[in-house]
Amino acid sequence: VPRWRQQWSGPGTTKRFPETVLARCVKYTEIHPEMRHVDCQSVWDAFKGAFISKHPCNITEEDYQPLMKLGTQTVPCNKILLWSRIKDLAHQFTQVQRDMFTLEDTLLGYLADDLTWCGEFNTSKINYQSCPDWRKDCSNNPVSVFWKTVSRRFAEAACDVVHVMLNGSRSKIFDKNSTFGSVEVHNLQPEKVQTLEAWVIHGGREDSRDLCQDPTIKELESIISKRNIQFSCKNIYRPDKFLQCVKNPEDSSCTSEI
């Protein structure tokens, strides 16, 4: 007799999830000498322990604490790049500007990037059929709690000037409900962070508007200023040229506005 299984609204666990996490861990620790001490089997065991046999709507930050401990990594606090709704460009940027870090450039972020996972209460099975959707099912699901936990800690670690890349093509350039807007903004530490600098990335080639005057950017400025952190904003009119100039800053065309 087949066991009844909870049907959730979101996609199920990414296929070959255990193998993927383990392989990513091995790859990351090989590339980053400062993380060579990490035991990837222990990392997988801690990751698994955070959600296996637990109700996927009842996950807490404490569930991830053993994983957080194993993944402890010193990130240069003044080289942190946050992003919202523009992950690919942010990652392209840090691949070129190697001394800057997005969350996904850390071991913990790299392990989970683009993956979905959940278990079932009282069984050791991984649910490959469906997982809870944040809106339709519950917010305390394994994936959402993981990203909330690591995002909060990443923001806490930041100091000096923190950069955030925002998508100027979205109706809400700054969205209070995004991970950046709901978690990271509120966990920047005013004792350490002097300035939040927003980079608004333009989508259209002929778009010459000053998107730093957008009402949602003004809202971000207000939130940040109330936290005693300075705010600055730059338009990135040509993201392709922006990346090219990061690669080749001496290029003569890189002195003009990008």
Epitope: Q65, K69, R153, E156
Partner: nanobody, 116 residues
Amino acid sequence: QVQLQESGGGLVQPGGSLRLSCGATGIIFSINDMGWYRQAPGKQRELVAEITRGGSTNYADSVKGRFTISRDNAKNTVYLQMNSLNPEDTAVYYCNAAHTFSGSFWGQGTQVTVSS
């Protein structure tokens, strides 16, 4: 940077008690784990007890039921109440504070000697 300062060590008779304290100063962010480690002469440093930001605790088997770790998040301070001390507990006790993306920080250590 974060500095950790331990206090409360000393000489105590077998069966006695001590309470260690460790305060974190400097640029204080929300530290995730705080804990106590110890190192006896000629031995490796070992975990004694640790406590997460949420209050979950973990103890070495050798101290379970005798030692209690607690934490005051507002003061960024961690305590170790040590009861029923025996000579095997003699060591330098180190405080540790860790943040997932800022690394691990250590105190200078405080000597605990259990002897009659």
